[in-house]
Interface confidence: low
C-alpha cells in the first residue's frame, strides 16, 4: 500500500489496532523490514507499507482527520470530498474525520443529501455500519450533537465557532463520497439548528445535546420541523431530566404555524402539543445551573407524522361537572408491538395536548379529540366511589349504577366501568338489584352477553370475588356485608346496543353479618347455575354465604350437587351447609368436611341455602357447584 | 462465545445472607432483550426459578420467596448478583445462572456449571 | 402459579426406539404476545441444564433432528424419534409465560 498526502492538506492518517479481538496470531504493520502496531502519516509525507497477515481489518482501523480552519482565512465551502479517495485505502475499517474552527460570529451549516440521517441513541448501532458523530464546541469545550445513521429526516445542521463530522464506514462498505457539503451562514446565536424534514408519514427520534449526558448549562438548541401541510405532527417526550436551576427555568418553546401565542411555552414535564398542521419549531432551552449540585438536563423525544384522521376535527365533551369522586382513563389496549411503523394513536385534550392515554376527573367539562387512525386500539376504563359515611343519612339510601350516556357516546369502546360502593364498617351493609335479573357466570352455563357485573369485596385484606353476572338470568338481587366494587365489564363493541339492558340499582341496608345473600327467583323453563364466592380460589375461611330460593306455589325445585363431596379440609373449625325450608323452618345440616354432599332433592317451598365455611388447610378449598330447577308439581315425582 | 459461571460462600449458618455472584462473558446485559435468571436444584430433586434481571434493569423474582431475595447487576463488570437473606437448612441447594438471549432464542440458552450452597449449624 | 405435570416419571428404552414425553399445564401458556414460552431441558447426571427446545417446538442450534416438541394451549410433547446411549438424563419441561417460571417434575430416560 501506498498513501500520499499533499503537502498543506491539513490530513493526518493514523493506522492503529482496533479492539483487540482474541485472534491466535498477531498482525503487524510492516514499514521498512520493521513491525509496528501504529502507523501515522502527515500532511507532505509518502508512505508504503505492508501487513504482515492476511486479513488486517480483523486487527486495525484507520483515521483520517482533515483540519479546516476558517479563522485565517476563507473557508472551502461546498460539496466535501473523502480525501485520500477511498480505493487508494487499505480495506480496513474508516473513520473520516472533518474537524472545523471558526469564528463565534460564524455560522456552519451541515447540509446532508438524500438519504437524510437519523439520530441514534447511546447503545444502538447503524444496520449498515455507517455512522455519522457530530460535535460542536463551546469555548475550549466538545458538545455532542449526536450520532446518525442514514436513513432519515435530519437535513441540516447549524452550529457555529466550529463543527466536528466523524464519518464511519465499514471496511466492506464501498460507499465513496461523504455525503454532506459545509456552507456559511450568519451567526444562530445558540448551540445549534437540527433540520428534520418528513416527505410523508413518519416518526423521527431525537436527543439533546450531549445525550445521555447532561445538556451544556443556558444554552438553546432548535429543532426545525418540515412537514407538508396535509399531514399532522404530535411530539411526545420519550425521556428527560432536569437539572438543578439557581436562575431561569429549563423550558422547551414551540413556535407553531397559526398559533396566537407564539413561541408557546411548556414545561419539559406537560404533555406536550399533538395534531399540528405544518412546519413547526422546537427549542430546548437551559438554566444557570446551581454550582454546588447542579443535576443534568437531557431530553430524548419523539415526532410522529401522520395523516389527520376523521376523529381529528371532531370535539367530543365529556361532561364530568355533576359526578363525584370519579375519573375516566382512556387507553390504548395492550397488543402485540409491530416492528413497521404504525402512526401514533393519540387523545387530546382541547385538540392540542395530545397523548396515547388521559384521564379526565369529575367536577369539570372535558372536551377532547382524537389522533387515530383506528380508534379500537384504544379503550375506556372509568372509576367512581360512592361511599356512605354517616349511616343515618344513608339508611334506606338508593343509587343507580348506570354508565352516563356521555361515556357511551365516545367513540371508543368501554372496557370496565368500575364503581367502588363503600360502607361505614359494622353499621349498614348493600344491597344490589338488577333492572333484569341476572345469570351467574359458570363453565356450565357461561354467560354470552356482551357485559357482566363483577362483583368483588373492596376490603385490601379480603381476597373474595363474588362472581362474574350478566342479565338473564335468576339472581333477583345481592345482598353483601361490606365495602365492595361492582365492575361493568364490556365484551362486544355491541354493548352501545345492549346498554339499554344494564342497570343496577345499589341500596345502604341495615348491617347484616353474612359476606354475602343471594335471592334467587328461578324461571320454570331453565336450569339455574350457582357457585359459591371466590370459585378458583375457595371460600375464604370462616366466611358464610347464602341463597334465598324461591318456589312458586305450583312449582317443585329440584337442588342437585355437582360433587359427591365438598373436598375441603378444616384446619380449625367446621365446615357446613344447612338447607332450610321457609314455611316449616325444617332444616337439614351437612358437615362439609365430613358428610357426602345431598343428593338432588326436591323443595315444594321456598328454602335457603347456606355455605359456612372452616379455616381450610391451603389446598383443600371450599367450591361448591349447585343447580336449581322448576317442574310443575303436577308431574308424578315418583 | 458465551460462559457463566456461579461463586457462592459453599458452606453458610442458618439466619445468615447467602450473596452469590454469575459472572458472565460473551454477551453484554445492555444489549436489549438480554436477561440472566437465577435457579437453584436440591441434590437428587427438581429445578426452582428464583428471580430473573432484564437488560433495562427490570426484576422478576418467585413470588414464594420474593420477601427474602434481591437480584441486581452491574453491566459494565459483566456480573448479576443475587442475595437471599435469613437462610436455612431447605435453601441448601446447587444454585445456577443462566441467560435468557432473547433476540436468538427467547429461552435460557447457556447455564453455568452451578455453584453448591451447603446452610449447615 | 402454573403446575407443570410431566409423565411418565421415568422410561426405559432401547437404543434406536422412538420415546415421547408428555407435559400438561395447569392453565394455558400462552404470553400476551401470542408466543408459547415452553422449553424442554435436558440434565446429564452430574451436570447443568442444556436447552432442546423453546418456544414449543424450534429446536436450539446444535440439536440433532431427532428431537422434536409439539403441543400447544395445555398439553405438550417432546419426541425422541431415535435414541441414543448421549441422551440419557433427566428430561424438563418448563413454563416461562407466566411468574413464577415453573418446571415439570422431569422424566428419567434410561437405556434398556
Known amino acids: 500500500f501506498e498513501i500520499a498526502l499533499p503537502r498543506e492538506s491539513n490530513i493526518t492518517v493514523l493506522i492503529k489496532l482496533g479492539t483487540p479481538t482474541l485472534l491466535a496470531k498477531p498482525c503487524y504493520i510492516v514499514i521498512s523490514k520493521r513491525h509496528i502496531t501504529m502507523l501515522s502519516i502527515k500532511s507532505g509525507e509518502r508512505i508504503v507499507f505492508t501487513f504482515s497477515c492476511q486479513s488486517p481489518e480483523n486487527h486495525f482501523v484507520i483515521e483520517i482527520q482533515k483540519n479546516i480552519d476558517c479563522m485565517s482565512g476563507p473557508c472551502p465551502f461546498g460539496e466535501v470530498q473523502l480525501q485520500p479517495s477511498t480505493s487508494l485505502l487499505p480495506t480496513l475499517n474508516r473513520t473520516f474525520i472533518w474537524d472545523v474552527k471558526a469564528h463565534k460570529s460564524i455560522g456552519l451549516e451541515l447540509q446532508f443529501s438524500i438519504p437524510r440521517l437519523r439520530q441514534i441513541g447511546p447503545g444502538e448501532s447503524c444496520p449498515d455500519g455507517v455512522t455519522h458523530s457530530i460535535s460542536g464546541r463551546i469555548d475550549a469545550t466538545v458538545v455532542r450533537i449526536g450520532t446518525f445513521c442514514s436513513n432519515g429526516t435530519v437535513s441540516r445542521i447549524k452550529m457555529q465557532e466550529g463543527v466536528k463530522m466523524a464519518l464511519h464506514l465499514p471496511w466492506f462498505h464501498p460507499r465513496n463520497v461523504s455525503g454532506f457539503s459545509i456552507a456559511n451562514r450568519s451567526s444562530i446565536k445558540r448551540l445549534c439548528i437540527i433540520e428534520s424534514v418528513f416527505e410523508g408519514e413518519g416518526s423521527a427520534t431525537l436527543m439533546s445535546a450531549n445525550y445521555p449526558e447532561g445538556f451544556p448549562e443556558d444554552e438553546l438548541m432548535t429543532w426545525q420541523f418540515v412537514v407538508p401541510a396535509h399531514l399532522r405532527a404530535s411530539v411526545s417526550f420519550l425521556n428527560f431530566n432536569l437539572s438543578n436551576c439557581e436562575r431561569k427555568e429549563e423550558r422547551v418553546e414551540y413556535y407553531i404555524p397559526g398559533s396566537t401565542t407564539n413561541p408557546e411555552v411548556f414545561k419539559l414535564e406537560d404533555k406536550q402539543p399533538g395534531n399540528m398542521a405544518g412546519n413547526f419549531n422546537l427549542s430546548l432551552q437551559g438554566c444557570d445551573q446551581d454550582a454546588q449540585s447542579p443535576g443534568i438536563l437531557r431530553l430524548q423525544f419523539q415526532v410522529l407524522v401522520q395523516h389527520p384522521q376523521n376523529e381529528s376535527n371532531k370535539i367530543y365533551v365529556v361532561d364530568l361537572s355533576n359526578e363525584r369522586a370519579m375519573s375516566l382513563t382512556i387507553e390504548p389496549r395492550p397488543v402485540k408491538q409491530s416492528r413497521k411503523f404504525v402512526p401514533g394513536c393519540f387523545v387530546c385534550l382541547e385538540s392540542r395536548t395530545c397523548s396515547s392515554n388521559l384521564t379526565l376527573t369529575s367536577g369539570s367539562k372535558h372536551k377532547i379529540s382524537f389522533l387515530c387512525d383506528d380508534l379500537t386500539r384504544l379503550w375506556m376504563n372509568v372509576e367512581k366511589t360512592i361511599s356512605c359515611t354517616d349511616h343515618r343519612y344513608c339508611q334506606r339510601k338508593s343509587y343507580s349504577l348506570q354508565v352516563p350516556s356521555d361515556i357511551l357516546h365516545l367513540p371508543v369502546e368501554l372496557h370496565d366501568f368500575s364503581w367502588k360502593l363503600l360502607v361505614p364498617k359494622d353499621r349498614l351493609s348493600l344491597v344490589l338489584v338488577p333492572a333484569q335479573k341476572l345469570q351467574q357466570h359458570t363453565h356450565e352455563k357461561p354467560c354470552n352477553t356482551s357485559f357482566s357485573y363483577l362483583v368483588a369485596s373492596a376490603i385490601p385484606s379480603q381476597d373474595l370475588y363474588f362472581g362474574s353476572f350478566c342479565p338473564g338470568g335468576s339472581i333477583k338481587q345481592i345482598q353483601v356485608k361490606q365495602n365492595i366494587s361492582v365492575t361493568l365489564r364490556t365484551f362486544a363493541p355491541s354493548f352501545q346496543q345492549e346498554a339499554s339492558r344494564q342497570g343496577l340499582t345499589v341500596s345502604f341496608i341495615p348491617y347484616f353479618k353474612e359476606e354475602g345473600v343471594f335471592t334467587v327467583t328461578p324461571d320454570t323453563k331453565s336450569k339455574v347455575y350457582l357457585r359459591t364466592p371466590n370459585w378458583d380460589r375457595g371460600l375464604p375461611s370462616l366466611t358464610s354465604v347464602s341463597w334465598n330460593i324461591s318456589v312458586p306455589r305450583d312449582q317443585v325445585a329440584c337442588l342437585t350437587f355437582f360433587k359427591e363431596r365438598s373436598g375441603v379440609v378444616c384446619q380449625t373449625g367446621r365446615a357446613f351447609m344447612i338447607i332450610q325450608e321457609q314455611r316449616t323452618r325444617a332444616e337439614e345440616i351437612f358437615s362439609l368436611d365430613e358428610d357426602v354432599l345431598p343428593k338432588p332433592s326436591f323443595h315444594h317451598h321456598s328454602f335457603w341455602v347456606n355455605i359456612s365455611n372452616c379455616s381450610p388447610t391451603s389446598g383443600k378449598q371450599l367450591d361448591l357447584l349447585f343447580s336449581v330447577t322448576l317442574t310443575p308439581r303436577t308431574v308424578d315425582l315418583t | 462465545q458465551v460462559t457463566l459461571k456461579e461463586s457462592g460462600p459453599g458452606i453458610l449458618q442458618p439466619s445468615q445472607t447467602l450473596s452469590l455472584t454469575c459472572s458472565f462473558s460473551?454477551?453484554?446485559?445492555?444489549?436489549?432483550?438480554?436477561?440472566v435468571s437465577w435457579f437453584r436444584q436440591p441434590s437428587g430433586k427438581g429445578l426452582e426459578w428464583l428471580a430473573h434481571?432484564?437488560?433495562?434493569?427490570?426484576?422478576r423474582y418467585n413470588p414464594s420467596l420474593k420477601s427474602r431475595l434481591t437480584i441486581s447487576k452491574d453491566t459494565s463488570s459483566n456480573q448479576v448478583f443475587l442475595r437471599i437473606t435469613n437462610v436455612d437448612t431447605s435453601d441448601t441447594a446447587t444454585y445456577y445462572c443462566?441467560?435468557?438471549?432473547?433476540?436468538?432464542?427467547?429461552?435460557?440458552?447457556?447455564w453455568g456449571q452451578g455453584t453448591s450452597v451447603t446452610v449447615s449449624s | 402459579d402454573v403446575l407443570m405435570t410431566q409423565t411418565p416419571l421415568s422410561l426405559s428404552v432401547s437404543l434406536g426406539d422412538q420415546a415421547s414425553i408428555s407435559c400438561r399445564s395447569s392453565?394455558?401458556?400462552?404470553?400476551?404476545?401470542?408466543?408459547?414460552?415452553l422449553e424442554w431441558y435436558l440434565q446429564k447426571p452430574g451436570q447443568s441444564p442444556k436447552l432442546l427446545i423453546y418456544?414449543?417446538?424450534n429446536r436450539f442450534s446444535g440439536i440433532p433432528d431427532r428431537f422434536s416438541g409439539s403441543g400447544s394451549g395445555t398439553d405438550f410433547t417432546l419426541k425422541i424419534s431415535r435414541v441414543e446411549a448421549e441422551d440419557l438424563g433427566i428430561y424438563y419441561c418448563f413454563q416461562s409465560s407466566h411468574v413464577p417460571w415453573t418446571f415439570g417434575g422431569g422424566t428419567k430416560l434410561e437405556i434398556k
Open positions: 443462566t441467560r435468557e438471549g432473547s433476540a436468538d432464542w427467547e429461552a435460557l440458552d447457556y
Open positions: 418456544k414449543v417446538s
Open positions: 434481571i432484564y437488560w433495562d434493569d427490570d426484576k
Open positions: 392453565q394455558t401458556i400462552v404470553y400476551s404476545n401470542g408466543n408459547s414460552y
Open positions: 460473551g454477551f453484554s446485559l445492555s444489549t436489549s432483550g438480554m436477561g
